[in-house]
């Protein structure tokens, strides 16, 4: 609970933010979580804290591990950990896939590709653009503020794009580099009222307390490249990101399969540690594009653990 | 966007125990913050009665600790207060409210309970 | 428990004049290089709407024309130019111990 995964390379710039925010203007304390040793807010140092960022300036292999922050306020302090890892850098043009941000889809009409976690840092224009290793040149690549936009979008284009930009530090500069996969959408067919192939509606899913347990949202909706169709997941009526339960999650990105020719999204919502209380929620499978919304309910019912007899 | 209402009775008899519910909808009461009871007799000031943590954690106003118990029932995402042995002087508008930090930073629309006979 | 007083009681002024609402604390609500004091907004009807926190931070989302200032026990919020949707009862909150107390309230009129 109140933790996040933030990673970078070595020689790099590493920016983290305290995954506990407070509003702006709290106090934050820094610490490193194995020795329980403050972090200074000294900028003279390499690692050091600024309000709710901690900042590795530049960063080291060594510096992996967990970082504690606390919000400070004298009737309510607020703890959050960052697990920060610093990779080697590779000789090899490859991107491991632990190093990679969350893929992103594009198409003829819309093909824009965030730098990620850019807005952590203090940076100028412009960004520096690579694919699968190799500097971006041509008039059909335009780098836009934090982002790069691929004009005519074609299949060629899908691949491992890489954003670098230097972040300046009271007159130092320190480089940072981020890679996310870009994938690219058919624009030829149709669509169709989406078609949710599981779970069925009114379904009761089994699930045992204090185990883990998944439930698939799965829907077709036409031919090809689809414009605004999701599936999602919610818990009575409330989006997953809004309830706010951290055990309950829906898996990051939606998965794009085609089935029989059909472009079909399926969206996982994971369960951790299964309790009691979530077998009074209801569970809605909704699936939606231009045509409509089509929604599947269903709900959770315990499963008797069996009994080995020897 | 998290949303709160306040429910139960709109009067109590004196002497009697004072009971509300607020719902919270759009977050979780075990994922983080504090859920606030406040209170405004009429015409007056606002009163901070006490708050649930989202840990369980229970913090009162000591002018009132011995006759307050706030409590939650996570499967109904709710948290409730009561009040014992209330007087005339109980009557007021409670809200339920939202603490991120220091600050209410959401509230309910607000009950008005009145204590008589 | 921190006491916080404000005055004036009420006050009424004129649009586009500076309005300034007070409130002192019964002792220091500042440690550790924060102040803990806050500003509500409650209008008739209404539950109160949070304006300014850590004694000089606007909340997102409300105008600018709003501004706190003050440290240790004297405070100040600032409304200027006042505009008539400003009417309404004004408090403070500390959270500097337990328990969170409120000031009696300003109410503010629009001539």
């Known amino acids: 609970k109140f933790s996040k995964q933030s990673w970078g390379l070595e020689n790099e710039a590493l920016i983290v933010r305290c995954p506990r925010q407070g509003k702006p203007s709290y106090t934050v304390d820094w610490y490193y979580s194995q020795t329980n040793k403050s972090i200074p807010t000294q900028e003279r140092n390499r690692v050091f804290a600024s309000g709710q960022l901690l900042k590795f300036l530049p960063a080291a292999v060594a510096d992996s591990g967990i970082y504690t922050c606390i919000v400070r306020s004298p009737t309510f302090n607020r703890t959050g950990y960052a697990n920060v890892t610093i990779y080697k850098k590779q000789s090899d043009c490859n991107v491991p896939d632990y190093l990679m941000y969350s893929t992103v889809s594009g198409s003829e009409k819309n093909s824009k590709i965030y730098c990620p976690t850019i807005d952590l840092y203090n940076w100028t224009a412009p960004l520096e653009w690579f694919k699968n290793c190799q500097a971006l040149q041509g008039s059909r690549y335009r780098a836009h503020k934090s982002f790069l936009v691929i004009d005519n979008v074609m299949t060629e284009d899908a691949g491992d794009y890489t954003c670098k930009f230097i972040h300046n530090e009271n007159g130092a500069n320190y480089s940072v580099t981020a890679t996310r996969s870009f994938t690219v959408k058919d624009e030829q067919g149709f669509s169709l009222f989406p078609v949710i192939g599981a779970p069925a509606q009114n379904e009761i899913k089994e699930v045992e307390i204090g185990k883990n347990a998944n439930l698939t949202c799965s829907a077709c909706f036409g031919k090809g490249t689809q414009f605004l169709a999701a599936v999602l997941w919610q818990l009575n009526g409330t989006k997953i990101t809004d309830f706010g339960e951290p055990r309950i999650q829906q898996e990051e990105g939606q998965n794009q399969s085609f089935s029989n020719g059909l472009a079909c999204l399926d969206m996982v919502l994971r369960i951790a540690d299964v309790k009691e209380e979530d077998l009074l929620l209801q569970y809605d499978c909704l699936a939606l594009n231009l045509h409509g919304l089509r929604r599947h309910t269903v709900r959770l019912s315990r499963k008797n653990p069996i009994d080995h007899h020897s | 966007q998290v949303q709160l209402q306040e429910s139960g009775p709109g009067l109590v008899k004196p002497s009697q125990t004072l009971s509300l519910t607020c719902t919270v909808s759009g977050y979780s009461i075990t994922s983080d913050y504090a859920w606030d009871w406040i209170r405004q007799p009429p015409g007056k000031g606002l009163e901070w009665i006490g708050y649930i943590r989202y840990s369980g954690d229970t913090y009162y106003n000591p002018s009132l600790k011995s006759r307050v118990t706030i409590s939650r029932d996570t499967s109904k995402n709710q948290f409730s207060l009561k009040l014992s042995s209330v007087t005339a002087a109980d009557t007021a508008v409670y809200y339920c409210a939202t603490t991120m930090m220091d600050t209410m930073d959401y509230w309910g629309q607000g009950t008005l309970v009145t204590v008589s006979s | 428990d921190i006491v916080l007083t404000q005055s004036p009681a009420s006050l009424a002024v004129s649009p586009g004049q500076r309005a300034t609402i007070t409130c002192r604390a019964s002792?220091?609500?500042?440690?550790?290089?924060?102040?803990?004091m806050h500003w509500y907004q409650q209008k008739p009807g209404q539950p109160p709407k949070l304006l300014i926190y850590?004694?000089?931070n606007l909340e997102s989302g409300v105008p600018a024309r709003f501004s706190g200032s003050g440290s240790g026990t004297d405070f100040t919020l600032t409304i200027n130019p006042v505009e008539a949707n400003d009417a309404a009862n004004y408090y403070c909150q500390h959270s500097r111990e337990f328990p969170l107390t409120f000031g009696q309230g300003t109410k503010l009129e629009i001539k």
């Open positions: 850590l004694a000089s």
């Open positions: 002792k220091s609500v500042s440690t550790s290089g924060n102040t803990y």
